[in-house]
């Protein structure tokens, strides 16, 4: 049976086997087409999600679709039901928490009272002044907290207590990529991880350990990528994996937070990378132990210079490394998180591409997660 499962796929009505390599090849080889059903699917960017959270204390902002203007949500008459609606609009199904935070001196958006209409937040028509003088600070999911804070050094062995959202994404029991837990159902990774194998069946996720082989595998229900843009072939290197069964969170299995829409990190901002990838550029094999390293944001202009990536780093990507080189992600780290710590840990980047590993002028290039929030929310909403 193991051999059959490895090399063949069983079609129903009538029952017969087809070679597994015919799965997800764009041809209907089973009479009912089930060989093309459980495949990596692409999902369009979709319409603008009309709510967002700002890095200013996770305050809620609402879009007026008529004018295209954004407004900050006033705390007046804001309820748990409105908080749930806001989070559902972003595709969350968990119970949110919210609180009032004072309107700051730098508040640049108009503040309006919020109401609900057909399960979407709207601005109250006769919105007067914000009497409470407070904005809504909203958290849709408890995320980004770990049991242990990493020490700031070069490269060292990591503990799952520091990075409980890190997962190993495996095909046929072999580690292919890293990934990050975003909520009980969803794992974030890179689209290029699935270039070779587009059937969902053999992909598994392993969570809750810093050692590669030692933890149970979780079945995957769906793998969703964003539509490919042939004008920017390296853009859109992002994928969401939906797990068959929701994760139970614990000290070693927890979600990381998505970034805020306005999370603009300046050059030299400290960040962290982790992974089981190669420790040398062409260096033989994966690390059995999870490794961590501190890096920093590298200015896109520097990264696009003629002695570096020559304009290939787009606004949907970011560069990170250390100016003198030597610390970088490598093969096998793809899909893993580039992380920033404020109050919580945020996944600001996804390990995507680069020339070699650790070169001084060619740092790691990462998918900029904030550029894809709208897509993530639209995928989640479609799957609620």
């Amino acid at each position: 049976k193991v051999i059959l499962d490895k090399y063949y796929f069983l079609c129903g009505q009538p029952l017969h086997f087809i070679p597994r390599k015919q799965l997800c090849d764009g041809e209907l080889d089973c009479p009912l087409g089930e060989d093309e059903e459980h495949c990596v699917k692409s999902f369009p960017e979709g319409p603008a999600v009309a709510v967002r959270l700002s890095k200013d204390r996770s305050t809620l902002q609402v879009l007026d679709s008529a004018t295209g203007n954004w407004f900050s949500a006033c705390f007046d008459n804001f309820t748990e039901a409105l908080a749930e609606t806001a989070c559902r609009q972003m595709g969350y199904s968990s119970k949110p928490t919210f609180r009032a935070v004072e309107i700051g001196p730098d508040q640049d958006l108009d503040v309006v009272e919020i109401t609900e209409n057909s399960q979407e937040l709207r601005m109250r028509n006769s919105s007067g002044p914000c009497l409470s003088g407070s904005l809504v600070s909203l958290h849709c999911l408890a995320c980004g907290k770990s049991l242990k804070t990493p020490r700031v050094v070069g490269v060292e062995e990591a503990s799952v207590d520091s990075w409980p959202w890190q997962v190993s994404i495996q095909y046929d029991k072999q580690h292919v990529c890293g990934g990050s837990i975003l909520d009980p159902h969803w794992v974030l990774t890179a689209a290029h991880c699935f270039r070779k194998h587009t059937d969902v069946f053999n992909w598994k996720v392993r969570a809750g350990s810093d050692k590669l082989g030692s933890f149970p595998s979780l079945a995957v229900a769906k793998i969703i990528i964003i539509e490919f843009n042939p004008m920017y072939p390296k853009d859109n290197d992002i994928a969401l994996m939906k797990l068959q069964f929701p994760l139970t969170f614990s000290g070693t299995v927890r979600p990381i937070c998505l970034p805020f829409f306005d999370e603009e990190l300046t050059p030299a901002t400290p960040l962290w990378i982790i992974g089981w990838g190669f420790t040398k550029q062409n260096g033989g094999k994966m690390s059995d132990i999870l490794l961590q390293a501190s890096v920093q944001v590298i200015d896109s202009t520097r990264c696009n210079a003629d002695d570096a990536y020559q304009g290939e780093v787009t606004e949907k990507m970011m560069c990170a490394g250390i100016p003198e080189g030597g610390v970088d992600t490598c093969q096998g780290d793809s899909g893993g998180p580039l992380m920033y710590q404020s109050d919580q840990w945020h996944v600001v980047g996804i390990v995507s591409w680069g020339y070699g590993c650790g070169g001084p002028s060619t740092p790691g290039v990462y998918t900029k997660v904030s550029a894809y929030l709208n897509w993530i929310y639209n995928v989640w909403k479609a799957e609620l």
């Epitope: 042939p230 004008m231 920017y232 787009t314 606004e315």
Partner: antibody
């Protein structure tokens, strides 16, 4: 220096097929996507699709789906664009163009395809 | 599909003039916009990519600006060799689409 050299002009009857070639030189053939764009006489530019010469993967604009096929021969660094079921509206100059940084930085000289009965 | 609308469709100017061509997208395309110049019987030539980055070898009198839906190509001081047709192109999503062109002729 980078060059894209296309095959010569063709005259075809309605319903026939045409295959235009584009030979690349002066750069790493597998390192850059190649796109096809056409221009009817006195008209604007119309994008037809793309090919990744490294993997052979292709993608076509909806208007041409089912009628266009892009292939490549890595041994000669040549990409081909075949358009079938030709009609008079397909009379145009067909260009191959190299993709770099989200723009088409090098273009072939163009191949005029005339469809006439 | 994203529609690209250029204005004006034709324009007469003199050598030394400052000329502006605009391009509007039917939806936001961030900065995913390119500008090309085409002379009769020749292939188009890339002038500007990513809305404002000058392609190598293109004279600095050409500049691009804009983001979202509205973009501009400016030629600061027209030279005789600049009389041609100019096209904008969005590279935000497929199908890639071009503006209908702006023909720049000598006054």
């Amino acid at each position: 220096q980078v060059q894209l050299v296309q095959s010569g002009a063709e005259v075809k009857k309605p319903g026939a097929s045409v295959k235009v070639s584009c030979k690349a030189s002066g750069y790493s053939f597998s390192g850059y996507y190649l796109h096809w764009v056409r221009q009817a006489p006195g008209q604007g530019l119309e994008w037809m699709g793309w090919m990744n010469p490294d993997s052979g993967n292709t993608g076509y604009a909806q208007n041409f789906q089912g009628r266009v096929t892009m292939t490549r021969d890595t041994s000669t660094s040549t990409v081909y664009m075949e358009l079938s079921s030709l009609r008079s509206e397909d009379t145009a100059v067909y260009y191959c163009a190299r993709l770099h940084r989200g723009g088409h930085d090098y273009w072939g000289q163009g191949t005029l395809v005339t469809v006439s009965s | 599909d994203i529609q690209m609308t250029q204005s004006p469709s034709s324009l007469s100017a003199s050598v030394g003039d400052r000329v502006t061509i605009t391009c509007r997208a039917s939806q936001s395309i961030s900065r995913y916009l390119n500008w090309y110049q085409q002379k009769p019987g020749k292939a188009p030539k890339l002038l500007i990519y990513a809305a404002s980055t000058l392609q190598s070898g293109v004279p600095s009198r050409f500049s691009g600006s804009g983001s979202g839906t509205d973009f501009t190509l400016t030629i600061s001081s027209l030279q005789p060799e600049d009389f041609a047709t100019y096209y904008c192109q969005q590279s935000y999503s497929t199908p890639v689409t071009f503006g209908q062109g702006t023909r720049l002729e000598i006054k």
